[in-house]
């Protein structure tokens, strides 16, 4: 026999959380001229969703309760000078990781 | 000493992948005479991203490669014809569940 | 296909200015740094100018240094080459190219678009 | 800046024949990285320059193996080893390892 109350708090507690997630370093550090290798990193983001929402909402949302930055050792290429050859160095990039995540209420109705 | 490729194989394996989501059995089914309790479910769905695509792509999209049907007991209350109350009973629902999960093309292009 | 189209050539006077415009398809225009060359009446080829994926980098040679300025539009996949004072000797067809993702080599490059400078 | 000296300035051959293209640097043209770019291209008539051989020895994607470069510090080599009529045209070697990045005169390869 399934415990149907078990489910109701399987879904409250897997249905928001950190995931992995794969974030172009490009983009997340805005550093346009500079090709980084590998180009993608995995993070952990919050993902999943909140479609029964234990809060009275209008919209339920997966937000990050808890954000931490970690380090993450990539090889930077850039021009330097010229119109041939990019600059290799190893550098270390800091990206936002989400460790805890929460159904939030984005616009509340009275009932 | 970080092995760069290792990281860009993580990427690869783990940013698009089967994973929680919770579903309103409700609105799955398309049964809106019907309560269920509990009224969601938690299901695997693709998920994540192809930020990094491997394809020389536009527009890369993470997708359902291997898709099951999977039975979940639940508690189904619905109006009596004619008389007020409802009928309760413990049925079987199938949800989509995904298993596997790829990284498709969405619009290719020739470079 | 990666193509390139050149535009914008024409018949300036000494002095003058003009903006030369390479329209991007085919490949992720952002990720790629992209150059300009011209080839003199002579058929001699002379570098003009680079330009780095994101635009922050540019590079010119002394010869236009000051004169010409390379940008990009990522959002309209368009190169730009603006020229002003310019010279007889910047007569030339003008060929914008794509630079390799590791600047080793120029891969692409258009069919070109004509600037004569002349009174 | 770097002078780069091709000869011939024209070269007449026959279908079939092998053709060798030389290009000289004024000095060496290695890069501060260690690597050498020196490119060759072909241009057609009326058709813009395109790469055939990259780092020196390296073929660009879709060149026929018939093509193959060599040399190194200031002196390179453009071989064809049975030339075919698609292969007319003028060819420019190319230093991009200092500034300004420099082009050689040309060769034009041409029927006898």
């Known amino acids: 026999v399934v415990d149907l109350n078990l489910l109701t708090e399987e879904v409250r507690l897997y249905s928001c959380t950190p995931r992995n997630f794969s974030v172009s370093i490009r983009e997340e550090l805005k550093r346009t001229d500079t090709i980084f290798w590998p180009g993608c990193l995995l993070v952990k983001r919050c993902g999943g969703n909140c479609a029964c929402c234990l809060h009275n909402c209008n919209e339920c949302q997966c937000v990050p309760s808890k954000v931490t930055k970690k380090y993450h050792e990539v090889l930077q290429l850039r021009p330097k000078t010229g119109v041939r050859g990019l600059h290799k160095s190893l550098t270390d990039v800091a990206l936002e990781h989400h460790e805890e995540c929460d159904c939030v209420c984005r616009g509340s109705t009275g009932g | 000493v970080v092995d760069l490729n290792l990281l860009t194989e993580e990427v690869r394996l783990y940013s698009c992948t089967p994973r929680n989501f919770s579903v309103s059995i409700r609105e799955e089914l398309k049964r809106t005479d019907t309560i269920f309790w509990p009224g969601c479910l938690l299901v695997k769905r693709c998920g994540g991203n192809c930020a990094c695509c491997l394809h020389n792509c536009n527009e890369c999209q993470c997708v359902p490669s291997k898709v099951t049907k999977k039975y979940h007991e639940v508690l189904q209350l619905r109006p009596k014809t004619g008389v007020r109350g409802l009928h309760k009973s413990l049925t079987d629902v199938a949800l989509e569940h995904h298993e596997e999960c790829d990284c498709v093309c969405r619009g290719s292009t020739g470079g | 296909e990666v193509q390139l189209v050149e535009s914008g050539g024409d018949l300036v006077k000494p002095g003058g200015s003009l903006k030369l415009s390479c329209a991007a398809s085919g490949f992720t225009f952002s990720n790629y740094g992209m150059s300009w060359v011209r080839q003199t009446p002579d058929k001699r080829l002379e570098w003009v100018a680079t330009?780095?994926?994101?635009?922050?980098?540019?590079y010119y040679p002394d010869s236009v240094k000051g004169r010409f300025t390379i940008s990009r539009d990522s959002a309209k996949n368009t190169l730009y080459l603006q020229m002003s004072s310019l010279k007889s000797e910047d007569t030339a067809m003008y060929y914008c190219?794509?630079?390799?993702?590791?600047?080793?080599?120029?891969?692409?490059w258009g069919q070109g678009t004509t600037l004569t400078v002349s009174s | 800046d770097v002078l780069m000296t091709q000869t011939p300035l024209s070269l007449p051959v026959s279908l079939g024949d092998q053709a060798s293209i030389s290009c000289r640097s004024n000095q060496s043209i290695v890069h501060s990285n260690g690597d050498t770019y020196l490119e060759w291209y072909l241009q057609k008539p009326g058709q813009s320059p395109k790469l055939l051989i990259y780092?020196?020895?390296n073929r660009f994607s879709g060149v026929p193996d018939r093509f193959s470069g060599s040399g190194s510090g200031t002196d390179f080599t453009l071989k064809i080893s049975r030339v075919e009529a698609e292969d007319l045209g003028v060819y420019y070697c190319?230093?991009?390892?200092?500034?300004?990045?420099?082009f050689g005169g040309g060769t034009k390869l041409e029927i006898k």
């Open positions: 780092k020196v020895s």
């Open positions: 190219a794509r630079q390799a993702p590791l600047w080793d080599y120029s891969d692409y």
């Open positions: 330009i780095g994926s994101g635009g922050s980098y540019t």
């Open positions: 190319f230093q991009g390892s200092h500034v300004p990045p420099t």
